[in-house]
């Protein structure tokens, strides 16, 4: 299905407009800022979401790199460039003709340079780490169940394959989510890692960007997880080129 | 194609323990996650737990906590699933089925378990 | 954990009759699944993700619903179609199953 048909909405991403335009009378949502159609049944590419988020351009990301070759997105919010598939373009650039690269999930992994800069691929973001920091529970919860939970979750509600969580790390009170996909790995159809990061960062602040569901409602046998800080680490397959140390 | 093979029929004794095996074939094992399901004679299914076979973290309902232990060789793509302290409520017929994005694709034929003295 | 009520446990059809089974959840589920079991053999998915056909399923069968209130249709009765349907919830742990609707044809 690509949208419900009672009442043509796109469940997976509440940034769209939706028309029973499509073929046969069928429900067709396009995103908001884009204009290009999505797949409702599955998630929305980052990239098509931070277009249509720039009406509202707050909250942006910043994020903690764990090594040399980790990125951080201290730029914050910017209106991306998107493929027709809707994935970033490697090369993005601003109003004053001022152009980066960027990694498949949308982060600047070389200095800025004019409208001369060349970016030749775009560069995958295989391997993502989600530290999270939950609230003081009256005890710590038992690994086994948070992993299985994180790991149900990552399923059920973002679709992505099991195989894609590599492992789930705790130590009261932090948790860590490892999510890798390296290309060869991504079949067709297989969500993205890197938008299932972003849709679980959105929803553990409370931005959810489905459509008609109650928001993260997290459970570990019943005791309530909740998050207190949300840190995300890019890794990309081949390592960023900056001129000097950030 | 996927396949779910579980082994056969087991009658025991009340009290003992009996392991019965989910053999998989058609696809990558370790990429997957394997559930166990339970159903008595003319009644519905009851969900047991889950393992996922690439990390080895494991879910049980409940009511299956100190009862089912779930367990996988990944060597012979193989799941398992022991049942001890056994008495007449644990026979049913148990099923194995492949998890994915999808709570469960594919089903095992099952295995019949009775327990009687 | 959420309870699925199926209704009606029992009913009957004739061939080529409409067929509604429906399953109520006791809280809000994002998605149901729906599985066909006939006697002496294993579950089989019909319908995920609410209303999508699973592979090889005819397209007589549907389902919709959001929420707490959810239903399996099947357009035109078929003498094969007579076996038992589970609705089943994984929103959150634990999975579970609805009892169940039989199906028999008249």
């Known amino acids: 299905h690509t949208a419900a048909q009672d009442n043509c909405t796109c469940p997976t991403n509440k940034m769209t407009v939706c028309s029973p335009d499509g073929p046969g009378g069928r429900c067709q949502c396009r995103a908001l800022g884009s204009g290009v159609a999505v797949d409702c049944s599955t998630l929305t590419s980052e990239c098509l979401l931070l277009k249509a988020r720039m009406s509202a351009p707050k909250n942006a990301r910043t994020l903690v790199r764990p090594n040399e070759h980790a990125l951080v997105d201290n730029d914050g919010l910017y209106d991306p460039d998107c493929d027709p598939e809707g994935r970033f373009k490697a090369r993005q650039c601003n109003q004053t003709s001022v152009c980066w690269c960027v990694n498949s999930v949308g982060v600047r992994r070389t200095d800025k340079g004019d409208l001369s800069l060349r970016c030749d691929e775009l560069v995958r973001t295989h391997h993502i780490l989600i530290d999270l920091r939950h609230r003081p529970t009256a005890g710590a919860f038992n690994h086994s169940d948070l992993d299985a939970e994180l790991r149900r979750l990552f399923r059920e509600r973002y679709r992505l394959h099991p195989k894609f969580v590599a492992a789930v790390h705790y130590e009261q009170p932090t948790i860590q989510i490892e999510l890798r996909q390296n290309t060869s790995q991504k079949a067709a159809g297989d969500v993205d890692i890197g938008d299932a990061a972003y849709y679980f960062e959105r929803d553990v602040k409370g931005e959810s960007l489905f459509q008609g569901r109650g928001g993260l409602d997290l459970r570990v046998r019943g005791e309530p997880l909740q998050v207190e800080r949300t840190l995300i680490y890019y890794l990309d397959e081949i390592p960023p080129k900056f001129s000097m140390k950030r | 194609q996927v396949q779910l093979q579980q082994s056969g029929p087991e009658l025991v004794k009340p009290g003992a323990s009996v392991k019965m095996s989910c053999k998989a074939s058609?696809?990558?094992?370790?990429?997957?996650?394997i559930g166990w399901v339970k159903q008595r004679t003319g009644q519905g299914l009851e969900w047991i737990g889950e393992?996922?076979?690439?990390?080895?973290?494991?879910y049980y309902t409940e009511k299956f906590k100190g009862k089912a232990t779930l367990t996988a060789d990944t060597s012979s793509n193989t799941a398992y699933m022991q049942l001890s302290s056994l008495t007449s409520e644990d026979s049913a017929v148990y099923f194995c089925?492949?998890?994915?994005?999808?709570?469960?694709?594919?089903w095992g034929q099952g295995t019949t378990l009775t327990v009687s003295s | 954990q959420i309870v699925l009520t199926q209704s009606p446990a029992i009913m009957s059809a004739s061939p080529g009759e409409k067929v509604t089974m429906t399953c109520s959840a006791s809280?809000?589920?994002?998605?149901m699944y729906w599985y066909q079991q006939k006697p002496g053999s294993s579950p089989r998915l019909l319908i995920y993700d609410t209303s999508t056909l699973a592979s090889g399923v005819p397209v007589r069968f549907s389902g919709s619903g959001s929420g707490t209130s959810y239903s399996l249709t099947i357009s035109r009765m078929e003498a094969e179609d007579a076996a038992t349907y589970y609705c089943q919830q994984w929103s959150s742990y634990p999975y579970t199953f609805g009892g169940g609707t039989k199906l028999e044809i008249k």
């Open positions: 809280s809000s589920v994002s998605y």
């Open positions: 393992i996922y076979l690439g990390s080895g973290t494991i």
């Open positions: 089925a492949r998890g994915s994005i999808f709570p469960f694709d594919y």
């Open positions: 058609g696809f990558t094992f370790t990429d997957y996650v």
